[in-house]
């Protein structure tokens, strides 16, 4: 991305805070550096170079320092061919751009939040679905296997399409898709528990192509710390989804005196939110933030896509380690409530449960800690990275091992508490999920760097269906086949249920601590990486000139 | 064939205890949903309570009539339901049906496909 | 609490009058309604579920419809077995509760 930003900086198309930076810089008569492109060197008036794309950035959130990428500096390069036709200085784009990009990103993470609180109201009133259709719990494992198998496997069909077609189109029809299926789904009668499954599966596919698609947007829209901060208002809605869905279910239920209202809620703010991503959201062209100044070529197949991603380490590693966030979640989510459940038993300030919901309290103050650690590892990870990226160019994957071998330790440290302090317990799963919590938006960003614009969907989707696939999909399960097993060489006692469940869980952070590791592979091959698709992106940039209108 | 058979009726005092069995027969008792029913002489039918099965935790629901008076319980090796009941009064004199729910593996219905012959219990001083 | 209410209480027919029993819902129950009916000195036995399903082995002649609040149980041509109660349930809340009963009588 060398030439190329210089050339959509001169074309007057670069981002508001980059053309900030530049005439900050020109100001202090700021010569281009030794990664900098030679055809942005010498042009303009008095000779003044323009600060390279790989040099310290000023942004909105911070600067950020480039990565020199290393690559010879080709003169007849497209972007510096347009470079040299450019104004001296560059344009900034109008304020109301800035603030419609403002609102397009507001408005995607809105919908991320409706996902998210639309798949969790389900789990806020899941007793009340388990009660009313008679469900047993192998048939509420069928639903939640129902909506990870179809959201695993429509997510690499959403990223080829996401990859090719009209984005926000997809996207507000995966809205308008979801929203008609889980308002439909609250008519179901009482004997079709078949079609509650169904419309799960149906809810899955919905959520699948706005989770795939809608952080590609974001990647197109902002670039370096700006993305970074943008993303991570994008997965702030994680949390927020999830601690207003449980509001939701319960709270709409309680008022309207049946759980069937709880699911007509977030339909009918999915349809506004629809709406609003067709009229509000731009229709950005794949790179736009990362080369202004060109359009990319015509795509590639989705064979070749999948032989780039495999073959793309850092790709590979921070997929794996996403893979283990998801695994430790999906497993802590399902199991630590009953756990502390457990303890309180043995610690005796609790009695022996016979009559589910067992550790209904605890269900509540887990979930309340988990939303709130979702608020502040975004915040923490986001502002650590910034913080870093001063430091490392590979501040990005060193974060977030940092935060997973940390999470490990905490992890670990629940069962020891657990046997004493129930307290202490919730303090280590409060900074365990803080930790874990804290690569969320950074994960998604290495991606936006080292996967280039016309991939991004795809990469994102696979990366989805891996995280998945060898994370929550099966944890919670293998967990409990774990305990059971446990258990059954053991004698029948209290002691026992909490200590085989306690034994199962301690493979978390087993699974973290490798989880880590696989982000300080990442770290290992970061830089390469990035520098590729930055120079893949060059090679895929055709000259505004000679783009057919 | 499907078989449900009640035992362990009788005349009994108020604030007395007694214990109802259901022996049953011809379906897959450990998968399915067990609930009683009586009627009281000359009166409609009134739902007592249910028991689940193993995959639904053996989880309980009373009528309140009855809740924190009767206690449902099962024992699926002996293919067996039972009704625990403390602190009879007068009005709980009925017959007490042992009944099956329909069961479709991932869920279970709410409504009795099977009965018992029923069992007497009177309740009187 | 959901309550049914049955009417009538009592119906008198003749063999081979086709009629009509109704069950009305205190709130919408959608379709979750099963009819039992109740011989004499018998134990119940399942006719219809969920408003309109026939269960197997129960005669053609008895069919059910309605949704949300009112059932409706049809007994066409009415035999000289069929003079028993019948009482409708709800499935929708727990707890599960029955109609009063109707008594179909000859006339």
């Known amino acids: 991305m060398m030439c190329l930003e210089c050339a959509s900086a001169a074309a007057g198309g670069a981002e508001e805070e980059e053309a900030d930076a530049e005439r900050r810089r020109r100001r202090r008569g700021a010569q281009p550096g030794a990664g900098g492109s030679a055809c942005c060197g010498a042009r303009g008036v008095g000779g003044a170079g323009v600060v390279s794309a790989d040099e310290e950035v000023q942004t909105l959130s911070g600067s950020v320092r480039r990565v020199p990428s290393g690559l010879p500096s080709i003169p007849s390069t497209p972007g510096c061919a347009a470079a040299a036709k450019g104004p001296s200085a560059p344009q900034p784009k109008p304020a109301s751009l800035g603030r419609g990009r403002g609102a397009a990103a507001a408005i995607l993470s809105l919908g991320n939040v409706l996902n998210y609180l639309d798949r969790y109201t389900v789990a806020g009133v899941l007793l009340d679905i388990q009660q009313h259709f008679g469900v047993k719990d192998r048939g509420a494992g069928l639903l939640q296997s129902v909506f990870i198998c179809s959201f695993m496997v429509a997510a690499p069909i959403f990223g080829y399409l996401g990859d090719r077609f009209n984005r926000k189109v997809i996207l507000s029809c995966g809205i308008f898709f979801w929203s008609a299926v889980t308002f439909s789904s609250s008519f179901i009668p009482q004997q079709y528990f078949w079609l509650l499954v169904l419309s799960r599966g149906l809810v899955g596919i919905g959520e699948a192509s706005y989770s795939t698609i809608a952080p590609t947007i974001i990647g197109d829209l902002f670039t370096k710390n700006t993305r970074t901060l943008m993303l991570s208002v994008f997965y702030f809605a994680i949390p927020l989804g999830s601690g207003l869905g449980y509001i939701t279910g319960s709270s709409v239920k309680q008022a309207a005196g049946d759980w069937h209202w709880a699911l007509r809620v977030s339909p009918v703010l999915g349809m506004i939110t629809g709406t609003l991503i067709l009229i509000l959201v731009p229709a950005t062209k794949r790179g736009h933030a990362d080369q202004l100044g060109g359009q990319l070529k015509a795509r590639t197949s989705w064979l070749r896509d999948m032989k780039a991603l495999i073959r793309n380490r850092s790709y590979v590693f921070s997929s794996l380690a996403t893979s283990a966030v998801s695994f430790a979640t999906g497993a802590l989510g399902m199991w630590i409530p009953l756990y502390l459940h457990r303890a309180q038993v043995v610690q005796k300030t609790a009695e022996t449960c016979n009559s589910p919901p067992c550790g209904a309290k605890d269900s509540l103050i887990f979930g309340a800690i988990t939303c709130f650690t979702g608020f502040l590892g975004v915040v923490t990870g986001a502002g650590a990275t910034r913080w870093c990226r001063l430091r490392t160019q590979r501040a990005d994957p060193l974060v977030c091992a940092v935060g997973m071998l940390g999470s490990a330790i905490f992890i670990c440290l629940i069962f020891v508490a657990a046997k004493t302090s129930i307290v202490g317990a919730y303090i280590c799963i409060f900074v365990g999920e803080t930790l874990l919590f804290s690569n969320w938006a950074i994960t998604a960003d290495i991606l936006m760097y080292v996967v280039i614009p016309t991939r991004r969907a795809t990469a994102v989707a696979l990366q989805s269906f891996t995280s998945h696939l060898l994370g929550d999909a099966g944890s919670p399960y293998l967990i409990g086949f774990i305990s059971d097993l446990i258990r059954q060489s053991t004698k029948d006692s209290p002691l026992w249920e909490f200590l085989s469940l306690g034994y199962a869980l301690m493979l978390c952070p087993f699974v973290v601590v490798l989880g880590g590791m696989f982000f300080l592979a990442t770290a290992l091959f970061f830089l390469s990486d990035r520098a590729k698709a930055e120079q893949q992106v060059n090679q895929l940039v055709m000259p505004p000139a000679s783009v057919k209108v | 064939e499907v078989q449900l058979v009640e035992t362990g009726g009788g005349l009994v005092q108020p604030g007395s205890s007694l214990k109802l069995s259901c022996s049953t027969s011809g379906f897959t008792f450990s998968e399915t949903w067990m609930s009683w029913v009586r009627q009281a002489p000359g009166k409609g039918l009134e739902w007592v309570g249910l028991i689940k099965d193993k995959n639904s935790n053996y989880e309980a629901n009373y009528a309140e009539s009855v809740k924190g008076r009767f206690t449902i319980s099962r024992d699926d090796s002996k293919r067996r339901v039972y009704l625990q009941m403390y602190t009879l009064r007068d009005q709980d004199t009925a017959t007490y049906y042992c009944t099956s729910h329909e069961d479709f593996y991932y869920y279970s219905s709410y409504y009795f496909d099977y009965w018992g012959q029923g069992v007497m219990v009177t309740v009187s001083s | 609490d959901i309550v049914l209410t049955q009417s009538p209480a009592t119906l008198s027919v003749t063999p081979g009058e086709s009629v009509s029993l109704s069950c009305r819902a205190s709130?919408?129950?959608?379709?979750?309604i099963h009819w039992y009916q109740q011989k004499s000195n018998e134990s119940p036995r399942l006719l219809i579920k969920?408003?309109?399903q026939s269960m197997s082995g129960i005669p053609s002649r008895f069919s059910g419809s309605g949704s949300g609040t009112d059932f409706t149980l049809r007994i066409n041509r009415v035999e000289s077995e069929d003079f028993s109660v019948y009482y409708c349930q709800q499935s929708y809340n727990l707890p599960l509760t029955f109609g009063s009963g109707t008594k179909l009588e000859i006339k």
């Open positions: 709130q919408g129950i959608s379709t979750s």
């Open positions: 969920y408003a309109s």
